[in-house]
């Protein structure tokens, strides 16, 4: 039950993390225009992995893509690379995962290879997590360094009363989106490595317990499970009792869908 | 195509409240904002402020602050200024004008004379 | 505030003439993200409100002749008239549509001879 339910919940924790990372790398607002301490502009900038946009008081937005890669910084293109794999990793975790869940019955999967994928999965959801936090630190280290410098030479306009004020940029909802939701990938990530113990064969000595039926003894021996360091292929999980008890394994669940816009 | 039109002169004491309006008419009234400017005679143009008449956003020029108010309706499509504590420097033709790409007024009321006279 | 300076603050021409106008900004009026100046022309004809000629420094607003330019860049801009007509004798106002508050210059009265 409880190992069902950490699997479950690290499923869906990852499945929003990975929404998350999805939507904080579409986003526009990765850095916005630094409003304090600075003249009030009728015009709002912001800026993205993809896009850089205005928005103006009366209302217009306009954005432009980025359509060169050579000139674009390599901070960025990094950046966008790192989101990229998360994403990818991320996905194809949510693949496995779906199939390695406890409530979901495939032909005669074992309980052994549910455990290899659900550790698969895992894996990939803290790496998808880490490329995500990796990716928005990075942003964020170079808005920072970008940000003292602009500082640094705010009024570059030289000689009279005419003055350029530089544009700063600050911290945008993506980066926090982006942090929250890789936290959320790497959290699901652990999650599926600690169901991934408890779904894998552990090899346990009970007793035999004996059973005398009239006329005759018949001898039930508990299943065992082989220890979670290797998944060997000599464990044949048979169910031996069952007790007439319906088990969690029994339990049909539909996974929910979850539309992202 | 668009109008909007202003209400008609007013002639006020000093101290006095005033409420201009401009009814906005061939766009969608929730969509541009609003601008008010001020013109005394044989001067040139200040701006007062601005509303966004979707969501009542308004945006003001420090020097009107206490004076102006600005509201819209949107059931009327109609946008109005109140002006308060008026005295003679107050005496100017108000314009609305709605926003436009650049932070340009494109559409003009045709003004509304106001004159602050003891 | 940003202070909007026009020159000259009137000239008379004679139609067919091509008629320069200036207008200074205390600040850059270009703005990074796009790379636009946030610098308006406007038209104003005695006992008429004002008419919008030109937005981001350089776009015509469409219906405006296309004898009316404007150019020039972060504080320097200037409204051409390659042809002036009659009808274009009016009063031209500058805007700064790029800080709060949003401001105008005091005018170039244009006259015909």
């Known amino acids: 039950m409880a190992v069902t339910a950490c699997q479950g919940l690290g499923f869906v924790v990852s499945l929003i993390g990975i929404a998350g990372i999805i939507a904080a790398t579409c986003m526009d607002q990765w850095s916005t225009q630094d409003l304090y301490n600075n003249p009030v502009t009728a015009v709002f900038n912001y800026q993205g992995l993809w896009r850089s946009c205005v928005r103006e008081s009366s209302g217009f937005t306009e954005c432009r893509g980025y359509f060169t890669l050579l000139g674009l910084p390599a901070m960025l293109q990094a950046v966008r690379a790192l989101m990229i794999v998360g994403i990818v990793l991320g996905a194809i975790g949510l693949l496995v995962s779906i199939f390695a869940l406890k409530c979901i019955r495939i032909g005669s999967m074992e309980d052994s290879a549910k455990a290899n994928m659900t550790l698969t999965s895992g894996i990939m959801f803290i790496v998808s997590g880490l490329c995500a936090i990796a990716g928005v630190s990075v942003f964020a280290n170079m808005l920072v360094t970008n940000f003292w410098m602009s500082t640094a030479n705010m009024y570059t306009g030289m000689g009279g009363m005419v003055q350029t004020v530089q544009t700063r940029y600050t911290f945008g909802a993506a980066l926090f989106v982006g942090w929250v939701a890789g936290g959320l990938t790497l959290i699901g990530g652990v999650m599926m490595c600690i169901a991934c113990r408890g779904l894998a064969p552990e090899e346990t000595n009970y007793k035999a317990v004996s059973y005398h039926a009239s006329g005759h003894s018949v001898a039930y021996k508990p299943g065992g499970f082989k220890a979670s360091t290797g998944f060997g292929s000599n464990t044949k999980n048979k169910k031996i009792y069952d007790g007439g008890a319906r088990t969690e394994d029994e339990v049909q669940s539909y996974p929910s869908k979850h539309d992202y816009v | 195509q668009v109008q909007l039109k202003q209400s008609g002169a007013e002639l006020v004491k000093p101290g006095a409240s005033l409420k201009l309006s401009c009814k906005a008419s061939g766009y969608t009234f929730t969509t541009y904002g609003i601008n008010w400017v001020r013109q005394r005679p044989e001067q040139g143009l200040e701006w007062i402020g601005w509303i966004f008449p979707g969501d009542a956003t308004t945006m003001y020029n420090e020097k009107f602050k206490g004076t102006a108010t600005l509201t819209a309706d949107k059931s009327s499509s109609t946008a109005y200024m109140q002006l308060s504590g008026l005295t003679s420097e107050d005496s100017a033709v108000y314009f609305c004008?709605?926003?436009?790409?650049?932070?340009?007024?494109?559409?003009w009321g045709q003004g509304t004379l106001v004159t602050v006279s003891a | 505030d940003i202070v909007m300076t026009q020159s000259p603050s009137s000239l008379t021409v004679t139609a067919g003439e091509k008629v320069t106008m200036s207008c200074k900004s205390s600040q850059s009026l270009l703005n990074s993200g796009n790379q636009k100046n946030y610098l308006t022309w406007y038209q104003q004809k005695p006992g008429q409100p004002p008419k919008l000629l030109i937005y981001?420094?350089?776009t015509r607003e469409s219906g405006v002749p296309d004898r009316f330019t404007g150019s020039g860049s972060g504080t320097d801009f200037t409204l051409t008239i390659s042809s002036v007509q009659a009808e274009d004798l009016a009063v031209y106002y500058c805007?700064?549509?790029?800080?709060?508050?949003?401001?105008f210059g005091a005018g170039t009265k244009l006259e015909i001879k």
């Open positions: 004008a709605r926003f436009y790409y650049g932070n340009s007024f494109v559409d």
């Open positions: 805007q700064n549509a790029y800080y709060y508050p949003l401001t």
């Open positions: 981001w420094a350089s």
